[in-house]
Amino acid sequence: EVEKTACPSGKKAREIDESLIFYKKWELEACVDAALLATQMDRVNAIPFTYEQLDVLKHKLDELYPQGYPESVIQHLGYLFLKMSPEDIRKWNVTSLETLKALLEVNKGHEMSPQVATLIDRFVKGRGQLDKDTLDTLTAFYPGYLCSLSPEELSSVPPSSIWAVRPQDLDTCDPRQLDVLYPKARLAFQNMNGSEYFVKIQSFLGGAPTEDLKALSQQNVSMDLATFMKLRTDAVLPLTVAEVQKLLGPHVEGLKAEERHRPVRDWILRQRQDDLDTLGLGLQGGIPNGYLVLDLSMQEALS
């Protein structure tokens, strides 16, 4: 808290300009009118204030707007945004994507801070859903943004927004998140032809069910091993050796290197050894020839 002192003669700020960088904290408090500051916020970011000076300017705005800043001020906060607490931001009503971009720009190159997370949360809740333009903006600044959302939050992403998602945006997503995103991606890309469709859907396949993987195996897609290793284990297990061979195409040779890792390991345990031998890769651990395989889950379903 800066104590109240009279502004020295001739120092009363007539406008927000670079002369203010020479003011001590108490002079800024005493000589800068909060209403003037609010109307000339667009100038603040161009002036190289220290964080101590920005603290004083924030204090003045807080006094002027105890219920939260108007968007006209928020849009021009610039470096002053770094001084805001999540509690401050929860009072805001941010509706303009331009405002969001301006504030994300200030934090560019840094990890997502609690302030930024709160800002995004306020913005998305205000819009009601994560539309394409917003998602475009957020993933441009924070490629991992999508994977930071809960499955419940992801359910508000409309399929049309999926077009904005890049493969790297999904790098840190877990299977639960991909389970939500995959059906949306399938819907978004449904009108594309085979090879183009696969290129787009590939990063979302960690959420694909068995029947979709079977369908893909009929389309000569040549899935790479990295993608295969991210598939849901429960979706891979029912695939036959022939289906996996068709799905992977020339990449099928990579199974050998991954035979001890899921989902390959678990899939091998479910295949007949003589079927695995047809691949000529030396995969071991399949069901020995002559053994009868009972699918108990199917039996339970029938009874």
Epitope: E18, F22, Y51, Q53
Partner: antibody
Amino acid sequence: QVQLVQSGAEVKKPGESLKISCKGSGYSFTTYWIGWVRQAPGKGLEWMGFIYPDKSYTNYSPSFQGQVTISADKSISTAYLQWSSLKASDTAMYYCARGLGGSFDVWGQGTLVTVSS
Amino acid sequence: DIALTQPASVSGSPGQSITISCTGTSSDVGDYNYVSWYQQHPGKAPKLMIYRVDNRPSGVSNRFSGSKSGNTASLTISGLQAEDEADYYCQSWVGPSTVFGGGTKLTVL
């Protein structure tokens, strides 16, 4: 166009006084600060101090505080750097530069000051 | 008493890319985005090449770019040309004071 024109080279003896100038044109002289920067022969740039001409606010580098005085006459858009008693170690090129947003975006051509007995 | 540390010299062949570093502290380069870079040819005044870490003034070639990581700012020059041979200085502002780096001599081989 925006430019800063500095006064000519000076040759002085130790103990003498000197005032060099920097005249701004092509922009609003009062709303930008002016910095002075020293470059000794074969050396790097050293910031000496600033002035904000509109209000004559100044700030000096601790290395130059008390050694030089920076002033301005906004009526003729000119900033000054002066010494009351020169030393041989003051021999250097002196640049004035326009300051904005934490950077020096326009520079004068430099004034060479030689102090020698 | 230089607060910002730069390599004394760097060199590169035409067409190559080079990077000049400028290391300060958390209270200058680290905390603030007020880092600038200047080019100075022999006998000439310095010229602003980059301001506020990564912004180029109009008229400066896009071969020059700036960045910052932690307490270190960097100037990268891509597609090196003979005319890039000069001294380069970084500058950090913590208002109302500023400091320059010691300078880096760039030689184009």
